[in-house]
């Protein structure tokens, strides 16, 4: 679809005569008829296959034709066509004299023709005008012409329909050849696909407008390249959506179980060494001078009773100092000025002379120690009990009283709640996260299977001869107490009396 445009510029008819040579009266009132048709080697009359157009009277005899784009068959003349432009044409331009106001062909005498020109040739679609001038014996016509495509038609022959659009069926303008030229930010055959934010993940992200990055389910982040872990995942990551791969030191479905309490919580104080010993459990190894589950308690240096021979210990900022009793001296009152004659051995210790009486040694009875047997043996000074256990002196030995959940000579072992066999009457113990549960055998109930619910073993009256029946709760059996003169488990046998 396009338009053949003809721009009339100047018509010269100086003598004001018709084609027949007869002059016009009073002058030649000139209008034009244009016929556009298919290419003919010799242009002949016949149907104007590409269209016709007529002008009103444009002037008398000789005149220039002004540009007039107001339409209505003015200048330039428009000959629209609704087909593919073939690239060739034939053009006939006739100048006619109008004696009256009726310009219809049938209203004019045949000799009203002033001049007739016919041209043919090739014509490509384009914006440039071709200038031409045709001269006859008495007239001259100057004009120009071109073929342009109608709005929204493109290509060498105006055959390609293309309408710019900016909606979801396309975001483009039209190139001169009719191909689409996508607006910035759009791509695809019809420029309908937005170009997402640079780096937006191809599979996990998408967009509905340019420079956007919307994430598909399971993905997050500016570029939709970060997976979303399982809901509730605490200390874990994912490589695909809804995973929960635990960070080092964490376990469980949601990675919320602490397997590295030492690192995450640093519970041991005062430079103690921490050792993980299970989920949320740990052991602190204290540096000298500290004690407590978390080595939080500072030991006095006098706590180790360094002063001998009854010396009294005084704490000082840089250590301790021993105040020695009469007859002793030295850093720890370890040197004596006494002899066995001074009866230096306490608590029943026996004295032995040494170095020809210049010195002595005490041999202490059990449970006493020191140079003079002055100290009761304290086997707890080395704080041997782990996990907050309490050390107790028991004569010549010591013993650790453990905190709940720990056992062993030194409370070094973690025990389950079931280790104490808390379930009575043969109940089965199950360790739970927060305590224990007993599964009781038939006949018993209660949190620890301590409640008897079975039928009394004496209910069937198993004892004979008026014997008294007793139930043994521990064995769920009966015992018969026989009257005088009867024996047997049920008192069923009489005994011969003397």
């Amino acid at each position: 679809s396009g338009v053949f445009q003809l721009q009339l510029q100047e018509f010269i008819n100086e003598r004001g005569v018709l084609a027949s040579g007869r002059p016009c009266e009073p002058g030649c009132r000139t209008f034009f008829r244009v016929c556009l048709k298919h290419f003919q080697a010799v242009v002949s009359p016949g149907p104007c296959t590409f269209g016709t157009v007529s002008t009103p009277v444009l002037g008398t005899n000789s005149f220039a034709v002004r540009d007039d784009s107001s339409g209505g068959g003015r200048n330039p003349l428009q000959l629209p066509f609704n087909f593919t432009w073939p690239g060739t044409f034939s053009l006939i331009i006739e100048a006619w004299h109008a004696p009256g106001d009726d310009l219809r062909p049938e209203a004019l005498p045949p000799d009203a023709l002033i001049s007739k020109i016919a041209i043919q040739g090739s014509l490509a679609v384009g914006q440039n005008w071709l200038l031409d001038e045709q001269t006859s014996t008495l007239t001259r016509l100057r004009y120009s012409y071109r073929v342009i495509c109608s709005d929204n038609y493109y290509g060498d022959n105006c055959s390609r329909l293309c309408k710019k659009r900016n909606d979801h069926f396309g975001h483009y303008v039209c190139q001169p050849d009719g191909n689409l030229s996508c607006l910035p930010g759009w791509t695809g055959e019809y420029c309908q696909q937005p170009i997402c934010l640079s780096g937006c993940h191809e599979q996990n992200g998408y967009c509905s407008k340019p420079a956007e990055c919307l994430c598909r389910p399971g993905w997050q982040g500016r570029l939709c390249n970060e997976c979303i872990p399982h809901n509730g995942c605490r200390h874990g990551t994912c490589s695909t959506p809804w995973q929960c791969t635990c960070d080092e030191g964490w376990g469980g479905l949601f990675c919320d179980q602490d397997l590295n309490y030492c690192t995450h919580h640093s519970p041991c104080k005062n430079g103690a060494t921490c050792s993980n010993s299970g989920q949320r459990s740990y052991t602190c190894t204290c540096r000298p001078g500290y004690t407590g589950v978390d080595c939080e308690l500072e030991l006095s240096e006098c706590d180790s009773n360094p002063c001998r021979n009854g010396g009294s210990c005084k704490d000082q900022e840089d250590g301790y100092h021993c105040l020695c009793p009469p007859g002793y001296y030295g850093l720890h009152c370890e040197h004596s000025t006494l002899s066995c004659a001074d009866s230096p051995c306490f608590n029943g210790g026996s004295c032995r002379e040494r170095n020809q009486g210049a010195n002595y040694a005490c041999e202490c009875p059990p449970n006493f120690t020191g140079s003079n047997c002055e100290k009761k043996v304290d086997r707890c000074t080395s704080n041997p009990c782990a996990n907050g256990g309490q050390c107790l002196n028991r004569g010549p030995s010591r013993m650790c009283r453990c905190r709940p959940g720990f056992t062993g000579t030194y409370c070094e072992l973690h025990v389950s709640d079931c280790a104490r066999n808390p379930c009575a009457h043969g109940g089965t113990c199950h360790d739970l996260e927060n305590g224990l549960m007993c599964t009781c055998p038939a006949g018993f109930s209660g949190r620890r299977c301590e409640v008897r619910t079975s039928i009394d073993a004496c209910a069937s009256s198993p004892c004979f001869n008026r014997a008294t029946c007793y139930t043994d709760l521990s064995t769920d059996t009966f015992v018969c107490n026989c009257p005088y003169g009867f024996v047997g488990s049920r008192c069923e046998f009489p005994v011969g009396l003397p």
Epitope: N152, K163, R165, D167, H168, F169, G188, Q192, S208
Partner: antibody
Framework: EVQLQESGPGLVKPSETLSLTCTVS??????????WGWIRQPPGKGLEWIGD???????YYNPSLKSRVTISVDTSKNQFSLKLSSVTAADTAVYYC?????????????WGQGTLVTVSS | SYELTQPPSVSVSPGQTASITCSGQ??????ASWYQQKPGQSPVLVIY???KRPSGIPERFSGSNSGDTATLTISGTQPMDEADYYC?????????FGGGTKLTVL
């Protein structure tokens, strides 16, 4: 050959939500060449475009219905759906689903057979 | 909002040419589609992008669109062409239908 089939309740009470599903057979709803639309026609009246959706989930709605309409797509089931909330008697119509082709400038070359939805208490 | 206007009815004798118009502001700058709908049936696309015919649509259906008016022309109209005809265009991202024209073949 691609076929479209609407399904859903034929009767909806006023103020409730109208829900319809269009099942596409004989072709993939995930094609980048089409939008999938809903059009309705009240009894004895003309056609009214409701909205459409692309396989990516991008939606476009008629401004006059936008506040009440939701169109969604389920590529795994080859279906797309229409929800129209707060319905009144004026929403009584035959509801069509259609395929709108990019190659046809947005023309709808395939239509479902339509389903009549009546809004009445 | 954008509107498309069609005449409510057009009558034509069999074998004659029927023309149905559709007018809208600068409609010629948009692509027009035409649908045929017979009673109790779904619409059928007969013209898209102003003048193109989908496969299976007879050659007697043609279309044009310029200025403010799109026209559907049915040459050599047959009784089977009696139906409602709807024009449709896109205004930005919204589909717009004309009110429909009832074509009666006398």
């Amino acid at each position: 050959e691609v076929q479209l089939q609407e399904s859903g309740p034929g009767l909806v009470k006023p103020s409730e939500t109208l829900s319809l599903t269009c099942t596409v057979s004989g072709g993939s709803i995930s094609s980048s060449s089409y939008y999938w639309g809903w059009i309705r026609q009240p009894p004895g009246k003309g056609l009214e475009w409701i909205g459409d959706i692309y396989y990516t989930g991008s939606t476009y709605y008629n401004p006059s219905l936008k506040s009440r309409v939701t169109i969604s797509v389920d590529t795994s089931k080859n279906q797309f759906s229409l929800k129209l909330s707060s319905v009144t008697a004026a929403d009584t119509a035959v509801y069509y689903c259609a395929r709108q082709a990019l190659a046809l400038g947005g023309g709808s070359d395939k239509w479902g057979q339509g389903t009549l939805v009546t809004v009445s208490s | 909002s954008y509107e498309l206007t069609q005449p409510p009815s057009v009558s034509v004798s069999p074998g004659q040419t029927a023309s149905i118009t559709c007018s809208g502001q600068r409609l010629g700058d948009k692509y027009a589609s035409w649908y045929q709908q017979k009673p109790g049936q779904s619409p059928v696309l007969v013209i898209y992008e102003d003048s193109k015919r989908p496969s299976g649509i007879p050659e007697r259906f043609s279309g044009s669109n310029s200025g403010d008016t799109a026209t559907l022309t049915i040459s050599g109209t047959q009784p089977m062409d009696e139906a409602d005809y709807y024009c449709q265009a896109w205004d930005r991202d919204t589909g717009v239908f004309g009110g429909g024209t009832k074509l009666t073949v006398l």
